[in-house]
């Protein structure tokens, strides 16, 4: 997260760290007791490493009573996701067992009504992604509030030049932005999960390259079918 600040500890009990061989790779969001939603491209970066999900964490390195690392029973990328595009960039991870719920571990309601969030709405994005252009990684969860950007502006040639489909949404990126390592994490508007950070190799913090988020409401049928 660029231009953000440290989150209040455990105030986002849905927040997950998708890890490979014990290292944070991507963000994720607990959407059901046994399921974490993330970004499909995160799996590509995992190669053949052991994928696990950390729940109940604030610090990645310090011991915390609520922290627990779960093995992944099943990884389900969206069937239409492709390595060379950010389309359908969603991944569902089934935990090896149901998560132990509590004040620091709790699923987040996700948007099912397929309607665009009003441009200008302030939404919260959180993650353990880099906090500087130099690539500094935080130990503790960071977050930032970002205004939603209308799709026409996001589709301008100097922004994303027509690449933003109706299944995506954009948020402003003027110094405050999601960045590398935040992919798969949640964009939360009014207490509801609206978007998942896409995992392209986008430049961060440049206002002409807004953040791109996969709209979960657009994938309600797929999410329901996998969770069923």
């Amino acid at each position: 997260i660029l231009g953000g600040r440290e989150a209040e500890a455990h105030a986002r009990p849905y927040m997950a760290s998708v890890q490979v061989n014990g290292e944070h790779l991507c963000g994720g969001v607990l959407v059901a007791e046994q399921w974490v939603l993330s970004a499909a491209h995160c799996l590509e970066d995992a190669a053949d490493g052991k994928v696990q999900v950390l729940l109940g964490a604030h610090s990645l390195s310090q011991p915390e009573p609520s922290k627990r690392l779960y093995d992944v029973l099943r990884a389900v990328p969206h069937p239409d996701s492709r390595p060379d595009t950010i389309d359908h960039d969603l991944l569902l991870l089934q935990l090896s067992e149901k998560a132990t719920l509590g004040p620091a571990v709790r699923p987040l309601p996700w948007q099912r009504v397929d309607r665009d969030v009003e441009p200008g709405t302030l939404c919260d994005v959180a993650g353990w992604g880099i906090v500087s252009h130099a690539g500094r990684r935080p130990d503790r969860l960071q977050h930032v509030l970002l205004p939603v950007l209308d799709r026409a502006t996001c589709n301008r040639r100097t922004h994303h030049d027509g690449a933003i489909t109706q299944r995506m949404m954009c948020a402003e990126s003027n110094r405050r932005d999601s960045c590398k390592g935040d992919s798969g994490g949640p964009l939360v508007c009014g207490g509801v999960l609206e978007g998942v950070v896409t995992s392209g190799s986008r430049v961060c913090g440049n206002r002409k390259k807004p953040g791109i988020y996969t709209r979960v409401a657009s994938y309600a049928a797929w999410i329901d079918s996998v969770l069923a």
Epitope: P119, D150, A152, N155, R157, T158, D161, A163, I164, N206
Partner: antibody, heavy 116, light 112 residues
Framework: EVQLQQSGPELVKPGASVKISCKAS????????TNWMRQRHGESLEWIGD????????SYNQKFRVKATLTVDKSSGTAYMGLRSLTSEDSAVYYC?????????WGQGTLVTVSA | DVLMTQTPLSLPVSLGDQASISCRSS???????????LEWYLQKPGQSPNLLIY???NRFSGVPDRFSGSGSGTDFTLKISRVEAEDLGVYYC?????????FGGGTTLEIK
């Protein structure tokens, strides 16, 4: 299939005004800016301005700021360009284009002829 | 405004020949976001322009690979490796990095 269908040719008298339309189909109108261009006979293209169909926000080439007014009707997915105080210098083909990717999609053009 | 100067004005070629069109901008057209919004369009007689190349060297979908774009800063080139009859028309370079966006004066590709 993305299409931009423009209104038909106009023959107008000097000093009059005209309003030409550009109806979008095959995509969500509000997801892309609409731009307008002018091309006089045998000449190159000039950018007139653009409009964000969500907000109605416009940007104009200084050269056309007094001449052109861009509007949209979101409900019908149509962009409009009004041209006022027309002179023979305004006789040209006017194009609407969708921005994104680049100017990949163009209307067929509307010929405006200003003649007494 | 950024002035886009194309040369030559007219380019007579034989079918199968290579054609090269030059475009020079009056100032650098590198955008503040780091990208260069230099595009090439082909306008056939009586038709609307068609996008060929965007961001200097990227072919738009469906554009044959005989078209290639290159250049940087202020100097750009469009090359057609083997001219076909359907390639005839007026070619325009365009910059979208600065407001107002501007087109070059055009280069007419014609049969020798």
């Amino acid at each position: 299939e993305v299409q931009l269908q423009q209104s038909g040719p106009e023959l107008v008298k000097p000093g009059a005004s005209v309003k030409i339309s550009c109806k979008a189909s095959g995509y969500t109108f509000t997801d892309y800016y609409t731009n307008w261009m002018r091309q006089r006979h045998g000449e190159s293209l000039e950018w007139i301005g653009d409009i964000n169909p969500n907000t109605g926000d416009t940007s104009y080439n200084q050269k056309f700021r007094v001449k052109a007014t861009l509007t949209v009707d979101k409900s019908s997915g149509t962009a409009y360009m009004g041209l006022r105080s027309l002179t023979s210098e305004d006789s040209a083909v006017y194009y609407c284009t969708r921005e994104g990717p680049s100017f990949a999609y163009w209307g067929q053009g509307t010929l405006v002829t200003v003649s007494a | 405004d950024v002035l886009m100067t194309q040369t030559p004005l007219s380019l007579p070629v034989s079918l199968g020949d290579q054609a090269s069109i030059s475009c020079r901008s009056s100032q650098t057209i590198v955008h503040s976001n780091g990208d260069t919004y230099l595009e090439w369009y082909l306008q056939k007689p009586g038709q609307s322009p068609n996008l060929l190349i965007y961001k200097v060297s990227n072919r738009f979908s469906g554009v044959p690979d005989r078209f290639s774009g290159s250049g940087s800063g202020t100097d750009f080139t469009l090359k057609i490796s083997r001219v076909e009859a359907e390639d005839l028309g007026v070619y325009y370079c365009f910059q979208g990095s600065h407001v107002p966006p501007t087109f070059g004066g055009g280069t007419t590709l014609e049969i020798k």
